[in-house]
Each structure stands twice: as C-alpha cells, then as structure tokens.
Interface confidence: medium
C-alpha cells in the first residue's frame, strides 16, 4: 500500500448562485485526517491520531491552504455554464501517493453533482474525461476557465503535485504514519434472532492496513457468500479500521461455526460463545 494524501473539496450552488461555504476533507493513508466544514474554515484534526501526526502546533497553515482551495473551487463552480435550478455540487478530489520504491503519483478529479467529468494526471499534465457528451461539456467549461484564469487560481491549480507531496512527506516525517501493521482485536457475539435461530456476529477492530479477510466457516468450510452479511471496512478515528461479518445459524449448532480472520499474512479462528457467555475476545500478536 502506498502512503497517500487525499483532498476532497466540495462547493455548492443554489439556482446558479454559488454558496459561500465549502466542505473540505483530507484523508491521510485512507484515514479521515483534517476537516473544514464551516463558513470560516478551521482545520480540525480528526481524532487523536491526526493530532499526533500534526504535532503540538496550531493548524494555521492547513487552514490557510484549505480556505484558499475552497475559494478557488467556488470560483470554478461559478464558471460552469447552464446550471440547472436547484442545488448542485462541484467536487474536486486531489490525491498524491508515495510508493514503497519512492515513486510518486498525483491526480486531480472533478465531479459535478457526483458525476466524474474531468481528471488530470498532475505529473504528466494529461487531461482525461469520460465519453459522455455531458461530461465533455462540463470539462470544456472548467478547462476553459482554468486556462483563462490561471492567475486568479494560482493557489489552487499551480504546483499542486509538489505541494501535496511536500505535505505528505511532512506528515510522514512525524513518525506516526510509518509503514506498520496493527493486528485486529476480534470479538464474536451472538443474539437471538427468531425461534430456533441465532445471529452470530464477528467484529474485527483496531487493525491496519485496511485489507482484511473476515468470514464464517461451518466445520472448517467457508459459508457461501449469500448466507453472510458484511459490514464496510471503516476508519475508527484512531488511524486504524474496523469491520464485521454476520450469519444466522441454528441454535445448538454453535460449536460447528468459527469466524476466520486473515490480516497481513497472519490468520486466526474464533469460536462462537455458547450458552450465556455473550462475548469472546481474542487479540493475537
């Protein structure tokens, strides 16, 4: 997994009039990291992990940068032609990555009302757009504006590749965001579902990186996909992730079922608690 920094900026218009607020979210290595969500942007670290990365400092620099980016994206939205009545959004997602071999990637993507219409490889400066004619019309709008108004938007559209990588390297140097493996804590719980049946849920939390295999097995054999229900792998606010898988089984057959977990080359199995024992915790190292 490469290290990554991802900026997600969203601005809104109502009946063709661009709204003054904007929303900015920054993700570091896939984790919510900073957020600006007010008219007057204050960069807010998302959880203790983000504060640890940023260190004991104010976030004036991040606030200034994110505010500038928001203003520039608002200007871009103002130049999108033929905005229909009602509420519309322009979103810019900017991503930079540093791979283990120290190679880098940077890209920028524009979405209007949630639909991708323009992307740029920030290293090669190559623009791409979907084939749909609506996307191409929007792309023409934005590219024309960026060309004509390059000076007005210099904070936003110049040296983005370098700036993003510089910030990412700065965050990585904090020592908190190092290539690391954090094993999951696994909990198995049961709850009464209906007469003769119980629902068993296997939860994995506190793990990093996010790739994990979690599934139910009966007599050592994986259950079919359609008999299991999975939760999304979600950040837990501490720089780690959580997820779950559940299935329904017949009461009295608990001993035949185990939760199988695989993460970063390690694996373990976890039985269903029987009787009145509701939770079994096991944390492998």
């Amino acid at each position: 997994e490469p290290h990554s920094l991802r900026y997600n900026l969203t601005v809104l218009s109502w009946d063709g009039s661009v709204q003054s607020g904007f929303l900015t979210e920054v993700h570091l290595d896939g984790q919510p990291f900073l957020r600006c969500d007010r008219q007057k942007c204050r960069a807010k670290p998302q959880g203790q992990w983000a504060e640890d990365v940023l260190g004991n400092k104010t976030w004036d620099r991040e606030t200034r940068d994110l505010t500038g980016n928001g203003k520039d994206l608002r200007m871009t939205l103002a130049h999108i032609k033929d905005q229909k009545e009602g509420l519309h959004s322009l979103q810019e997602i900017r991503v930079c990555e540093i791979h283990e071999d120290n190679s880098t990637r940077s890209s920028q993507h524009f979405y209007y009302d949630g639909e991708l219409f323009l992307s740029q490889n920030l290293e090669t400066k190559e623009w791409t757009m979907p084939q749909s004619s609506r996307a191409q019309t929007l792309a023409m709008n934005v590219r024309n504006f960026l060309k004509e108004d390059a000076m007005k938007t210099k904070t936003h559209y110049h040296a983005m590749h370098a700036d993003c990588l510089q910030e990412l390297r700065r965050y990585l140097k904090s020592g908190v965001v190092l290539r690391r493996t954090v094993p999951p804590m696994v909990n198995v719980t049961r709850s009464e579902a209906s007469e003769g049946n119980i629902t068993v849920t296997c939860r994995a939390s506190g793990f990093y990186p996010w790739n994990i295999t979690l599934s139910w097995r009966q007599d050592g054999v994986s259950l079919s996909h359609d008999t299991q229900q999975w939760g999304d792998v979600l950040p837990d606010g501490n720089g780690t992730y959580q997820t779950w898988v559940a299935t329904r089984i017949c009461q009295g057959e608990e001993q035949r079922f185990t939760c199988y977990m695989e993460h970063s080359g390690n694996h373990s199995t976890h039985p269903v608690p029987s009787g009145k024992v509701l939770v079994l915790q096991s944390h492998w190292q």
Epitope: D15, G16, S17, V18, A78, H79, K81, D82, Q83, K84, E85, S132, S133, R134, Q136, T137, M140, N141, N144, F145, E148
Partner: antibody, heavy 118, light 107 residues
Framework: QITLKESGPGILKPSQTLSLTCSFS??????????VGWIRQPSGKGLEWLAH???????YYNPSLKSQLTISKDTSRNQVFLRITSVDTADTATYYC??????????WGQGTTLTVSS | DIVMTQSPATLSVTPGDRVSLSCRAS??????LHWYQQKSHESPRLLIK???QSISGIPSRFSGSGSGSDFTLSINSVEPEDVGVYYC?????????FGGGTKLEIK
C-alpha cells in the same frame, strides 16, 4: 421587462461577411450565469444554434460552422455581435438572438432576415 | 452531436382534442429537454423547461413528460391559437441541437 432586438444588413452577396447586432435591455451580461446566443432559421425550416457568449467572455460555437463564426459583446452597451464570413445562399435565413441562463433560451428577439443573392 | 427527432412532422387536430407530440434524442439527455412554440411569423417561445417544468405565463393545458431519450409534449385541450410549429431542444450537451419540429394544424 426583458427585450432583445436583432439588426443586420438584410441583403448580402455570396462571399461577403455578415455582421449582426443584438441589442438587449432588462438584464446585464455582467451578471454571473448570463449568456446570449444566436440561432438561425431558413425559411420554412427548423432552428439551428450558431454561437453563444457568456458573462465571463467564454464563447461557444457550433462545430460545423466554427471556422466562419465570431461572437463578441459590449457589456456596457448591452450588445452582442455575430460575424459570419464568406456567406453563401445557404446562409439565407432569419437570425435570432436569445438569452440563456439556466440551460434554456427564455427570451428571444423578433429576428432579422438575411438574403444572400448574387 | 445529439440528434433530436420529432414526430409526427404534421398533426391535424380538432379544437378540444388532447394531443401528444413526440421527441426522441439519439442518446440519453436525462431531463435536459426544452420545448418551444413558434407561431407563424413570430419568434420561438419557451413552453416547457427540463422536460416537465412549467413556465410562468404559459397556459396550464401544456405539459411535458419523459426522461432519458423519449419525451412528450401534451396539449390537454387544443385551442385554435395553439397552431404553429413545436420544437424540442437538447439542453444537455454541447452543441445544443433542436428537433425538426412538429407542425400543429387545426382541421
């Protein structure tokens, strides 16, 4: 009250340049989101969009005619102009200017007729 | 370019009839479809915006429907003053294109 009015030469010879003016009132082309375009209609036929200019001076042209067309504006005088070079008999039509704000042409001028004849 | 096809080319109706005019786009344009009415020796007038949204000052007997690539303009009870040519317009994608028109006549 919003009005638009087109004016032009009326008659031209083939290969000459057509210059059209759209004079409007009741709105300003300096307003964000505002645009004015040109549409033409040969007698007894359908409508063909030609060109459009926006408040920020961004210009759109019909690709099939782009090499012949130039659209411009004078915001302070509330006027939009269209030039078509090298006209021929196929350019004989009524030329309309129309206001466009949120995706549709909501106000149209009365039209000006051009005849191209040698 | 998106090609807009209108049918029928001509429609002869009796006052009081309910009529439907069809417009088809060569690819999906969501609801970015606008209808215009043009009476003889007059300039076009906006009737319906975004497939079904009414326009202030337009009689309520005019309504629009459809989404994607198939659209319909309906006139609830035709009146003699409704004669003219009706055009649909692609407002979705550049270049903006119009249909060939449907001519409405009174028998």
């Amino acid at each position: 009250q919003i009005t638009l009015k087109e004016s032009g030469p009326g008659i031209l010879k083939p290969s000459q340049t057509l210059s059209l003016t759209c004079s409007f009132s009741g709105f300003s082309l300096s307003t964000s989101g505002m645009g004015v375009g040109w549409i033409r209609q040969p007698s007894g036929k359908g409508l063909e969009w030609l060109a459009h200019i926006w408040w920020d001076d961004d210009k759109y042209y019909n690709p099939s005619l782009k090499s012949q067309l130039t659209i411009s504006k004078d915001t302070s005088r509330n006027q939009v102009f269209l030039r078509i070079t090298s006209v021929d008999t196929a350019d004989t039509a009524t030329y309309y200017c129309a206001r466009r704000t949120q995706g549709y042409f909501d106000y149209w001028g009365q039209g000006t007729t051009l005849t191209v004849s040698s | 370019d998106i090609v807009m096809t209108q049918s029928p080319a001509t429609l002869s109706v009796t006052p009081g009839d309910r009529v439907s005019l069809s417009c088809r786009a060569s690819q999906s344009i969501s609801d970015y479809l606008h209808w215009y009415q043009q009476k003889s020796h007059e300039s076009p007038r906006l009737l319906i915006k975004y497939a079904s949204q009414s326009i202030s000052g337009i009689p309520s007997r005019f309504s629009g429907s459809g989404s994607g690539s198939d659209f319909t303009l309906s006139i609830n009870s035709v009146e003699p003053e409704d004669v003219g040519v009706y055009y649909c317009q692609n407002g979705h994608s550049f270049p903006w294109t119009f249909g060939g028109g449907t001519k409405l006549e009174i028998k």
